[in-house]
Every structure is written in structure tokens, then in C-alpha cells.
């Protein structure tokens, strides 16, 4: 079964994949795809190398290591929950059925949100109940602040205050909900 790797929303994710070139600079085509490795190819390709260089890539996907030495580990920049899933690293070694293929599972967790001190003070002072983010299950719920009974005007005001903050971004990316009552 595939190996599992984890990252938080907003971080860069790292998926390792290596091979040993027969000689320095004697590179092998490699492809990375989203989805499990099919029988011959790489799935929905996000990055590809040839015998010389990276010849195809999409935004946010890059090789951070020295691919000329066989480090073809994939970095995914600024991940969101949508980046979760299986990734295929396929090392297309020439010859008959010499391919090495690896399925790697990427699990993205909601960011551990630490509100700005002023926002935290305002929340606690104004609302002694709970603001939470919803992750994949109960264990993923994180307390952000306290809230009392809130009316719709207060929710709107709170949303406006959060709109341009980093906290708002974290809430959006992790599928945040405001729980009332």
C-alpha cells in the first residue's frame, strides 16, 4: 500500500521520490501525476522531466532537490485541502518493463490557527462561546475563541473583521464553520 505523507493547509508539502542515475547527467524521464499510477503512464501529469531537464510543470508543483542527481521529490506549494489524495511518481527507466512506480498518499490537515492577539481579546471580551473549524472529524475541531449567543448582525460584523486577516484565509481553506449555541 502507498506511504502516507502529511502537511497543513498553507504549508508546502513534500513527497519524496529518488533514483540513482547510471552516471552523472545520465538522467531518466520521470513524471509526477495526481492519482494512482496507471499501467503505463502517470495519471494527470503535474510535472515531467526528460533526459535533460524539467520539460513540463504546473503552478505550485516543483522539484526542490537536485534532480540531476536523482532527487525527483515533489514540492507542492501552499497546499489546500483539495491537494489531498494519491500522487504517482514514475521513474521511466529505459528497457522492458523497467519502470519504477510509487503511489504516495498526501493528507492535508487544516492549519493550526492561532488568532492575532487583538482579535483573540475582542472575541473573548465580546463572546464567551466557541468558534471552531471543522476538519475531517471530531479530532480535527480546533478552538479559536469564545462566543456567547450571537445575532446575525454580530456574525456579519465578525466576518467583516476577519475578511482580510490571515485567520480568514485559514478558516476558508479548512472549511471553517461558526458554531452557535
Amino acid at each position: 500500500s502507498e506511504v502516507e505523507y502529511r502537511a497543513e493547509v498553507g504549508q508546502n508539502a513534500y513527497l519524496p521520490c529518488f533514483y540513482t542515475p547510471a552516471a552523472p547527467g545520465n538522467l531518466v524521464p520521470v513524471c509526477w501525476g495526481k492519482g494512482a499510477c496507471p499501467v503505463f503512464e502517470c495519471g494527470n501529469v503535474v510535472l515531467r522531466t526528460d533526459e535533460r531537464d524539467v520539460n513540463y510543470w504546473t503552478s505550485r508543483y516543483w522539484l526542490n532537490g537536485d534532480f540531476r542527481k536523482g532527487d525527483v521529490s515533489l514540492t507542492i506549494e501552499n497546499v489546500t485541502l483539495a491537494d489531498s489524495g494519491i500522487y504517482c511518481c514514475r521513474i521511466q527507466i529505459p528497457g522492458i518493463m523497467n519502470d519504477e512506480k510509487f503511489n504516495l498518499k498526501l493528507v492535508i490537515k487544516p492549519a493550526k490557527v492561532t488568532p492575532a492577539p487583538t482579535l483573540q481579546r475582542d472575541f473573548t471580551a465580546a463572546f464567551p462561546r466557541m468558534l471552531t473549524t471543522r476538519g475531517h472529524g471530531p479530532a480535527e475541531t480546533q478552538t479559536l475563541g469564545s462566543l456567547p449567543d450571537i445575532n446575525l448582525t454580530q456574525i456579519s460584523t465578525l466576518a467583516n473583521e476577519l475578511r482580510d486577516s490571515r485567520l480568514a484565509n485559514d478558516l476558508r481553506d479548512s472549511g471553517a464553520t461558526i458554531r452557535i449555541g
Epitope: V28, P29, V30, C31, G33, G35, A36, P38, V39, F40, E41, C42, G43, N44, V45, I86, R90, Q92, I93, P94, G95, I96, M97, N98, D99, N103
Partner: antibody, heavy 119, light 111 residues
Framework: EVQLVESGGGLVQPGGSLRLSCAAS????????MSWVRQAPGKGLEWVAA???????YFPDSVKGRFTISRDNAKNSCYLQMNSLRAEDTAVYYC?????????????WGQGTLVTVSS | DIVLTQSPATLSVSPGERATLSCRAS??????????MQWYQQKPGQAPRLLIY???NVESGVPARFSGSGSGTEFTLTISSLQSEDFAVYYC?????????FGGGTKVEIK
């Protein structure tokens, strides 16, 4: 429009060799796995070779060591070199494009070229 | 190798009727939640044509009367209302493992 045109078929004696060509057009050839599939007269389909976009080769045991597949991305062409031919290799040989991102099934086929192995 | 067994070998159907073709694999062709099974149509003197991929996805340009279903080792191609142009041979094919293999085919003929 995607097109695959096979050539090189014909009559050959047992033990002989033949090289089939597949000229592709209408798509970015280098991005696709290519396969050869054959069909003996009145029989079903049999996959005989594949080459991935990265140049990896795949064969069933029935032809391994006798057939080889290659590609020339600059010429948008794929080739099947058949050696040590046997009577049971007599068939229509189709060039087929593997579906992008997968390669293991075929969304475009040529019209085929007939190979007859007989003395 | 994964052996694909198609049944029946020949199916006699009247135009307008429903046709149900079966393909059984010697082992599961499930892979990360996808069934790696395809269906092709072949008419005399022509190359095969892809109809269904990944068990149930209808290829672009294929009429809606064709549908595929199944998972694991049991798969079905259904033609809801046979048209005259549908009389042909139908093959299933797995893309789970090398060697890629095809079923022996089902000939759909006019009753």
C-alpha cells in the same frame, strides 16, 4: 483530427523479419503511450506491445524476445520490429493510441496492416 | 495474466430490444476505487472503437443508449435499444495489469 496510419505489412516466411510503421498526426505524439494490437483472421484482439511516453517498453510473453517497439517523437512515428516470425503471428496489426494520462486503453486506432507468415 | 471471459459468445436480438453483454475477469480489476475495464465495438473490416472506459464512463461521441456497469470481476455492457448500426462484435479489455488482455468477444446479431 487524430490519425494513425500503419504500413509495412506483407507476406514473410517463417523465421523472417518485418518492421511495421505507424505515422501519427493530429495530436502531441510525445505525450502519449502507443500500442500495437493484433487480430488473427476470424479471431479476437490481442495486445502485443506498448511504449510509454517516457520510452518504457512492455510486451506479453507471447512475443517477448522476438518483437520490439520503438518511437521517434521527432517524426511522430511508432514502430514494431518483428523477428523470428511464426505462422501464428499472421494477423492484422493495429497501431493504437493509449488514452492520455493512462495509456492502458485505446481511444484511437489505425485501420491496420496485414502480416501473413507463410512459406 | 488476467483472463476475461465474455458471455454469451453470440447474442441474437431484434432491433429496438435491449442487449446485455457480460464480461468476467479472473481477478479483480479494481484500483484505488476505479474499475479498469473497457468496452469496444468492432464492425467487419473496421478497427475497434472505444465505447466505455473505467467500467461506466461513456466515451465522447458514443450514443447514450450504450452504458457500462460493474465492479471487481463482473462487468456488463448494456445497449438499451438496439439500432441497425449496433450489430457488431463487442470486446471487453482490462488495463489493470500487463499484459493487457481482451475478452473473446460477443457477437450481437439480428434475430
Amino acid at each position: 483530427e487524430v490519425q494513425l496510419v500503419e504500413s509495412g505489412g506483407g507476406l514473410v516466411q517463417p523465421g523472417g523479419s518485418l518492421r511495421l510503421s505507424c505515422a501519427a498526426s493530429g495530436f502531441t505524439f510525445s505525450r502519449y503511450a502507443m500500442s500495437w494490437v493484433r487480430q488473427a483472421p476470424g479471431k479476437g484482439l490481442e495486445w502485443v506491445a506498448a511504449i510509454s511516453s517516457g520510452g518504457s517498453l512492455y510486451f506479453p510473453d507471447s512475443v517477448k524476445g522476438r518483437f520490439t517497439i520503438s518511437r521517434d517523437n521527432a517524426k511522430n512515428s511508432c514502430y514494431l520490429q518483428m523477428n523470428s516470425l511464426r505462422a501464428e503471428d499472421t494477423a492484422v496489426y493495429y497501431c493504437a493510441r493509449g488514452r492520455e494520462a493512462d495509456g492502458g486503453y485505446f481511444d484511437y486506432w489505425g485501420q491496420g496492416t496485414l502480416v501473413t507468415v507463410s512459406s | 495474466d488476467i483472463v476475461l471471459t465474455q458471455s454469451p459468445a453470440t447474442l441474437s436480438v431484434s432491433p429496438g430490444e435491449r442487449a446485455t453483454l457480460s464480461c468476467r475477469a479472473s481477478e479483480s480489476v479494481e484500483y484505488y476505487g476505479t474499475s479498469l475495464m473497457q468496452w469496444y465495438q468492432q464492425k467487419p473490416g473496421q478497427a475497434p472503437r472505444l465505447l466505455i472506459y473505467a467500467a461506466s464512463n461513456v466515451e465522447s461521441g458514443v450514443p447514450a443508449r450504450f452504458s457500462g456497469s460493474g465492479s471487481g470481476t463482473e462487468f456488463t455492457l448494456t445497449i438499451s435499444s438496439l439500432q441497425s448500426e449496433d450489430f457488431a462484435v463487442y470486446y471487453c479489455q482490462q488495463s489493470m495489469k500487463v499484459p493487457l488482455t481482451f475478452g473473446g468477444g460477443t457477437k450481437v446479431e439480428i434475430k
